[in-house]
């Protein structure tokens, strides 16, 4: 689509005569008829296939034609066409005398023609005017002409339609050749694709407007390049959404089970060595002079009862000292000056002479020991309590105070963690060496199956055409990440030719 423009500049008819040679009375009131048609080697009468246009009376005899309008007419004259410009044309320009005001062809006498010119040739689309002058024996016409494209049409033949737009269907202006030139922030064949925030992750982020970065489910951060771990993940990280990969020293589905109690809590006191022995379980190896589960108790050197034969022990800064009873001597009161005659055996012990009465030995009743049966038997010396239990002397017997999770006379039995039915919503309980584990039925999760979760929205494979499915745990819905060439909430529609635009 375009316009053939003809600009009349000057008409000379010095004698004011018609083509027949007859003069006009009082002068030749001149108007023009223009016929534009397809190329003809010899221009002949017939339909003006490209269009016609007439002017009002522009002057008398000889005159110059002003630009733009003159007496209501337009200059240049416009001959629009709605087809591809062929590059060639034929042009007929007739000058007529108008005796009255009626300029219709049928209202004029046939001899009112002043002059007629016909040209033909090739003409390319362009902004430049071609100047021409045609002379006959009595008249001269100077004019120029050109072909330009209509608004929104471009190219060598005005055949390329391009209408600038900035809406859902595209964001572009048109280049001189009719190609699209995308507005800043847009790309793609029809400039419909926004250019996301610089660095926005190609798979995990997207945008609906330029310079933004919207994250797909399971991703976050300014560039949508940080995954969101599984809800409930305590001491873990992820490399893909909803994962929970445990940090060093942590275990369990949510990385909330402490496998390195020693490092995280430092329970052993007084320089003791700590050893991990399972979830929240540890053993302290005490330095000399300390005791207790956490080596929190300081031992007295007299606690080992080093003084024999009823000697009394006194703690000193650099050790201990034994005060011996009469008849005994030595560092630990181990030497005797007594015999059976002195009744040296305590607590009902019976005395036996040795070395012809120079020495003796005491035979002690149960629960007593020592060379003079002066000591009660300490039933805890053999460390009979297992699993870190604490041994307590209780009169003639002993007992073990067990740590949490253990029972039995010697704390040798592991308490069944499943005995109290800890798994909710019908979960199955499994006893482990260091705790328990719940296997949850569908629709529940958490350490104890206490969290009601939705069934995985992606389980039914709702996405088509090899699209990636993401479950959005916050809304119980799925989102399909379409591969190139597919669109739709399930990626079900192939991207065909762009929709035809309603120009």
């Amino acid at each position: 689509s375009g316009v053939f423009q003809l600009q009349l500049q000057e008409f000379i008819n010095e004698r004011g005569v018609l083509a027949s040679g007859r003069p006009c009375e009082p002068g030749c009131r001149t108007f023009f008829r223009v016929c534009l048609k397809h190329f003809q080697a010899v221009v002949s009468p017939g339909p003006c296939t490209f269009g016609t246009v007439s002017t009002p009376v522009l002057g008398t005899n000889s005159f110059a034609v002003r630009d733009d309008s003159s007496g209501g007419g337009r200059n240049p004259l416009q001959l629009p066409f709605n087809f591809t410009w062929p590059g060639t044309f034929s042009l007929i320009i007739e000058a007529w005398h108008a005796p009255g005001d009626d300029l219709r062809p049928e209202a004029l006498p046939p001899d009112a023609l002043i002059s007629k010119i016909a040209i033909q040739g090739s003409l390319a689309v362009g902004q430049n005017w071609l100047l021409d002058e045609q002379t006959s024996t009595l008249t001269r016409l100077r004019y120029s002409y050109r072909v330009i494209c209509s608004d929104n049409y471009y190219g060598d033949n005005c055949s390329r339609l391009c209408k600038k737009r900035n809406d859902h269907f595209g964001h572009y202006v048109c280049q001189p050749d009719g190609n699209l030139s995308c507005l800043p922030g847009w790309t793609g064949e029809y400039c419909q694709q926004p250019i996301c925030l610089s660095g926005c992750h190609e798979q995990n982020g997207y945008c609906s407007k330029p310079a933004e970065c919207l994250c797909r489910p399971g991703w976050q951060g300014r560039l949508c390049n940080e995954c969101i771990p599984h809800n409930g993940c305590r001491h873990g990280t992820c490399s893909t959404p909803w994962q929970c990969t445990c940090d060093e020293g942590w275990g369990g589905l949510f990385c909330d089970q402490d496998l390195n109690y020693c490092t995280h809590h430092s329970p052993c006191k007084n320089g003791a060595t700590c050893s991990n022995s399972g979830q929240r379980s540890y053993t302290c190896t005490c330095r000399p002079g300390y005791t207790g589960v956490d080596c929190e108790l300081e031992l007295s050197e007299c606690d080992s009862n080093p003084c024999r034969n009823g000697g009394s022990c006194k703690d000193q800064e650099d050790g201990y000292h034994c005060l011996c009873p009469p008849g005994y001597y030595g560092l630990h009161c181990e030497h005797s000056t007594l015999s059976c005659a002195d009744s040296p055996c305590f607590n009902g012990g019976s005395c036996r002479e040795r070395n012809q009465g120079a020495n003796y030995a005491c035979e002690c009743p149960p629960n007593f020991t020592g060379s003079n049966c002066e000591k009660k038997v300490d039933r805890c010396t053999s460390n009979p309590c297992a699993n870190g239990g604490q041994c307590l002397n209780r009169g003639p017997s002993r007992m073990c105070r067990c740590r949490p999770g253990f029972t039995g006379t010697y704390c040798e039995l592991h308490v069944s963690d499943c005995a109290r039915n800890p798994c909710a919503h019908g979960g199955t309980c499994h006893d482990l060496e260091n705790g328990l584990m719940c296997t949850c039925p569908a629709g529940f999760s958490g350490r104890r199956c206490e969290v009601r979760t939705s069934i995985d929205a992606c389980a039914s494979s709702p996405c088509f055409n090899r699209a990636t499915c993401y479950t959005d745990l916050s809304t119980d819905t799925f989102v399909c990440n379409c591969p190139y060439g597919f669109v739709g909430s399930r990626c079900e529609f192939p991207v065909g030719l762009p929709p035809s635009f309603p120009w």
């Epitope: 982020g205 976050q220 951060g221 771990p229």
Partner: nanobody, 123 residues
């Protein structure tokens, strides 16, 4: 169920200070980026500040840079906004929100919002 409950708003004189808190529940707070958004009467929401999940990276709108400080306590599931040198133009309802997308200057889409707390700066 995700819940965000803001508190700490009130009436304060120009130049004064306020500390806003946002208590989060129903999700693993320490795994999510968080932000503060405000809405003045008759205006649209305006992003104020944001902080990444670990708390090591913070972002501020130009209008509050140097005056406001965002922080978080993941152990207590709480987000904070310390507001100093307050101006009358800071008057708005302040919301804490989980950002879902970012623009060139800051967050621009949000997955969840709290109910908001009113801050009024006036003499």
């Amino acid at each position: 169920e995700v819940q965000l409950v803001e508190s700490g708003g009130g009436l304060v004189q120009p130049g004064g200070s306020l500390r806003l808190s946002c208590a989060a529940s129903g999700f693993t707070f320490g795994s999510y980026d968080m932000s503060w958004v405000r809405q003045a009467p008759g205006k649209g929401p305006e992003w104020v500040s944001a902080i990444n999940s670990g708390g090591g990276t913070t972002y501020y709108a130009d209008s509050v840079k140097g005056r406001f400080t965002i922080s978080r306590d993941n152990a207590k599931n709480t987000l904070f906004l310390q507001m100093n040198s307050l101006k009358p133009e800071d008057t708005a309802v302040y919301y804490c929100a989980i950002p879902r997308g970012w623009g060139p200057t800051g967050p621009l889409e949000y997955g969840y919002w709290g109910q908001g707390t009113q801050v009024t700066v006036s003499s």
